[in-house]
């Protein structure tokens, strides 16, 4: 069937349109185009005779039309009047006619729109604003944009006049935005320039900063006022109702108690005509006195006395605070505060209670600290320590012993040998000692203030023969690749050489072995399982030598990666499966099995009688050593084939 297609259907003025003919019949004589929906000689645009290829203009021809041999019609430089229907009349060779009608519409190219407003400075919560999109254009659609977004849904926004007018009722400051309108028709779309709505608002209730309302005498008062307002507010300050100045900030240096009072900030907006005020009450405090601490016992005795520290002066309705060692008071049953916190009592003082102690008086502004007070706690003497630590001496050397005991005041010392008083000194010196100087050496420490005494006794052996040494260790069960072990050869003896043997051999050269403390200490760094050997120390001097009993190092290690045996992985159905797992570990590891991820038993051997292909799968042995905190595992795949179908092994 003969049809006409308009390309495009909507045409902009000044552009062109092609009326394209589809399904044109064969054997044509010619055809003719008419304006309108029917064949009307008065409205013929153009005729065309195929045989002569001759185009003949009709009464409606405008000089802008071109006819093509395929009957299509091109109309150029379109004008508004071209809108409408066009009819093609086809004359066939058999003089049977056919007709088809097509149409298109013509629209103007839209101009750039602009926005007009009925109120350039609306007042918040009072005015409405109507924006109108200009010019008014027929067959145009009007759209609106706020901050480049489509209009939000709001009961305060209303479109009217075919969407050409946008009304904002009861404007708010949040309506201050960029507004654009857009006109659209089928052939064009244009957006206006932005219009910024300038909403007058405020002033809101002003805020006064800082929020601080308490000041100390002698400080500067610097208050700032701010109120949200458009245009910006004008500010005025009033103190106790009396006008001070028209500034945003109020500054009063070196204030006194007399500056206490109500401070009012007034914000004024000349455009809205509104005023708002905020009042803050400022209190100026006089400088409080500096506190100090008194004590009921300036020299308390450790574990005997209590001490009461009192914060002076006594001021009514005051908060008292305490600090020990610059920290707030620790929670302790030995520390007690009085009801008003003014007195801190230390029950049964210790030497660690020396302080320093500080008290504080808190007012509304700050805390005033006292000077620190240190307690002179009388303590001790503790058990005295006699040095050096040697207990064996060779005849002919000098014996020089020193005694020390922690004590306050410092201890007075006395020396006794086998119970007989020798001298009242901290050091005891005996030259050129002999075997007769062997005995019990007692140091007595006395604290004259507390009246307490403590003694320590040391056995001194003067002998050419050395004693049998022994080995002490700082770690009886070191973990491999982690721990170090220090062996020490006891006792500590003067003018003595210390020697070491490992498994009956002298020490091997190794960066992991270190001798120190005059060869008396042997340190093994980063022990390994190979260090689990017999260690012997020896002492010798020019007269004698002696060796210790061996000490065997128990190194914790593993578990290493386990081994499952036998290594076979293929079995015949009906055989017995007997898997054994082994992992090097000290202590022996805990074993457990999983078959296809399912936990089984915690034994070293896994036994399954008369296996079938159902026993196919992964067999995992897990090993764990809680002493080293380490785990390990291995997985083995087992294949069971039906009897006679595989060259596999049987258990």
């Amino acid at each position: 069937k003969l049809t006409i297609e308009s390309t495009p259907f909507n045409v902009a003025e000044g552009k062109e349109v092609l009326l394209l003919v589809h399904n044109l019949p064969q054997h044509l004589f010619g055809y003719s185009w008419y304006k309108g929906e029917r064949v009307d000689g008065n409205r013929q645009i153009i005729g065309y005779v195929i045989g002569t290829q001759q185009a003949t203009p009709g009464p409606a021809y405008s000089g802008r039309e071109i006819i093509y041999p395929n009957a299509s019609l091109l109309i150029q430089n379109i004008i508004q009047n071209d809108t409408g229907f066009y009819t093609l009349h086809v004359i066939k060779s058999d003089l049977v006619n056919e007709e088809a009608t097509g149409q298109f519409r013509v629209y103007p190219e839209l101009p750039k729109p602009s926005i007009s407003s009925n109120n350039s400075k609306p007042v918040e919560d009072k005015d409405a604003v109507a924006f109108t999109c200009e010019p008014e254009t027929q067959d145009a659609t009007y759209l609106w944009w706020v901050n480049n977004q489509s209009l939000p849904v709001s009961p305060r926004l209303q479109l009217s006049n075919g969407n050409r007018t946008l009304t904002l009722f009861n404007v708010t400051r949040n309506d201050t935005a960029s507004y654009k309108c857009e006109t659209q028709n089928p052939v064009s779309a244009r957006r206006s320039d932005s219009v910024i709505l300038n909403v007058l608002y405020g002033p809101d209730a002003p805020t006064i900063s800082p929020l601080n309302t308490s000041y100390r005498s002698g400080e500067n008062l610097n208050l700032s006022c701010h109120a949200a307002s458009n245009p910006p507010a004008q500010y005025s300050w009033f103190v106790n109702g009396t006008f001070q100045q028209s500034t945003q900030e109020l500054f009063i240096p070196n204030i006194t108690v007399n500056n206490s009072g109500s401070y009012t900030c007034q914000a004024h907006n000349s455009d809205t005509g509104l005023n708002r005020t905020t009042v803050t009450t400022i209190t100026v405090y006089a400088e409080p006195p500096k506190p100090f601490i008194t004590s009921n016992n300036s020299n308390p005795v450790e574990d005997e006395d209590a001490v009461a520290l009192t914060c002076e002066p006594e001021i009514q309705n005051t908060t008292y605070l305490w600090w020990v060692n610059n920290q707030s008071l620790p929670v302790s049953p030995r520390l007690q505060l009085s009801n008003d916190n003014r007195t801190l009592t230390l029950l049964s003082v210790t030497r660690n209670d020396v302080g320093p102690y500080e008290c504080g008086i808190q007012n509304e502004l700050s805390v005033d600290h006292s000077d620190p007070v240190i307690l002179n706690v009388l303590y001790g003497p503790d058990d005295p320590t006699i040095s050096p630590s040697y207990t064996y001496y060779r005849p002919g050397v000098n014996l020089s012993l020193s005694c020390h005991a922690a004590s306050n005041p410092p201890a007075q010392y006395s020396w006794l040998i086998d119970g007989n008083i020798q001298q009242h000194t901290q050091e005891l010196f005996i030259s050129n000692i002999t075997e007769k100087n062997s005995g019990l050496y007692t140091c007595q420490a006395n604290n004259s203030a507390s009246g307490h005494s403590r003694t320590t006794v040391k056995t001194i052996t003067v002998s050419a023969e050395l004693p049998k040494p022994s080995i002490s260790s700082n770690n009886s069960k070191p973990v491999e690749d982690k721990d170090a072990v220090a062996f020490t050869c006891e006792p500590e003896a003067q003018n003595t050489t210390y020697l070491w043997w490992v498994n009956g051999q002298s020490l091997p050269v190794s960066p992991r072995l270190q001798l120190s403390n005059g060869n008396r200490t042997l340190t093994l760094f980063n022990v390994t399982r190979n260090d689990a050997r017999a260690y012997v120390c020896g002492i010798q001097n020019s007269v004698s030598a002696n060796r210790s009993d061996p000490v065997t190092l128990d190194v914790l290690y593993g578990p290493d990666t386990p081994i499952i045996s036998p290594p076979d992985s293929s079995y015949l159905s009906g055989a017995n499966l007997n898997l054994s797992c082994h992992s090097a570990s000290n202590p022996s590891p805990q074993y457990s099995w999983r078959i296809n991820g399912i936990p089984q038993q915690h034994t070293q051997v896994l036994f399954i009688a008369k296996i079938t292909p159902n026993n196919n799968g992964t067999y995992a042995c897990f090993v764990s050593n809680l002493a080293t905190g380490r785990n390990n595992s291995i997985v083995k795949s087992i294949t069971v084939s039906a009897s006679g179908t595989s060259p596999g092994l049987s258990a």
């Epitope: 022996s588 805990q590 034994t603 051997v605 809680l626 905190g629």
Partner: antibody
């Protein structure tokens, strides 16, 4: 299910010996080690030693070394504990108990106990 | 030998109470510690091994913690059926030794 069934109560004279049996069922006897623990009347638990039924290896508490003998018959899945030179302080309930696994595991299944009374 | 010391030797608590029993080893036993429950006239029953592993079938109100030398058995909400004597036992090499036991009763 795992079961350990012990022999019945025994009354013995001081200086005599007693042999307590423990028949295991419900598991592979040779795979788990068997321990012996005793409990004197109103007292706590005291470990005597263990046997590895697979190898026959035994390990005794120092206190029972030389007096206790542990054996195992794998053909009947039965363990035995013999205590010689009995004294009145050996009066106790004797338990056999299976170790939960091998090496450094606790005891998961216990026999019902055998009361041994030593009295003149 | 490693000595095991339990405390308290006995305790009395109400149904629903949280109960804690402690066990101390004379030397480091790492995590090799088990807890047993023995009801009057019954055989001991293993509750926990490796200090914190709950044995299958034991109610979750029982829990164990600790390592080194100090260990704890906790019953989060005591039930009437929990009346028993509880023993700790180290399983770090032989000889195995047990604590002296803690008797738990209902008030």
């Amino acid at each position: 299910q795992v079961q350990l069934v012990q022999s019945g109560a025994e009354v013995k004279k001081p200086g005599a010996s007693v042999k307590v049996s423990c028949k295991a069922s419900g598991y592979i006897f040779t795979s788990y080690w068997l321990h012996w623990v005793r409990q004197a009347p109103g007292q706590g638990l005291e470990w005597i030693g263990y046997i590895n039924p697979n190898t026959g290896y035994t390990n005794y508490s120092q206190k029972f070394q030389g007096r206790a003998t542990m054996t195992a018959d794998t053909s009947t899945s039965t363990a035995y504990m013999e205590l010689s030179s009995l004294r009145s302080e050996d009066t106790a309930v004797y338990y056999c108990a299976r170790e939960y696994g091998n090496y450094n595991y606790p005891l998961d299944y216990w026999g019902q106990g055998t009361l041994v009374t030593v009295s003149s | 030998d490693i000595q095991m010391t339990q405390s308290p030797s006995s305790l009395s608590a109400s149904v629903g109470d949280r109960v804690t029993i402690t066990c101390r080893a004379s030397e480091n036993i790492y995590g090799y510690l088990a807890w047993y429950q023995q009801k009057p006239g019954k055989v001991p029953k293993l509750l926990i091994y490796n200090a914190k592993n709950l044995v299958e079938g034991v109610p979750s109100r029982f829990s164990g913690s600790g390592s080194g030398t100090d260990f704890t058995l906790t019953i989060s909400s005591l039930q009437p059926e929990d009346v028993a004597t509880y023993y700790c036992q180290h399983h770090y090499g032989t000889p195995y030794t047990f604590g002296q036991g803690t008797k738990v009763e209902i008030k």
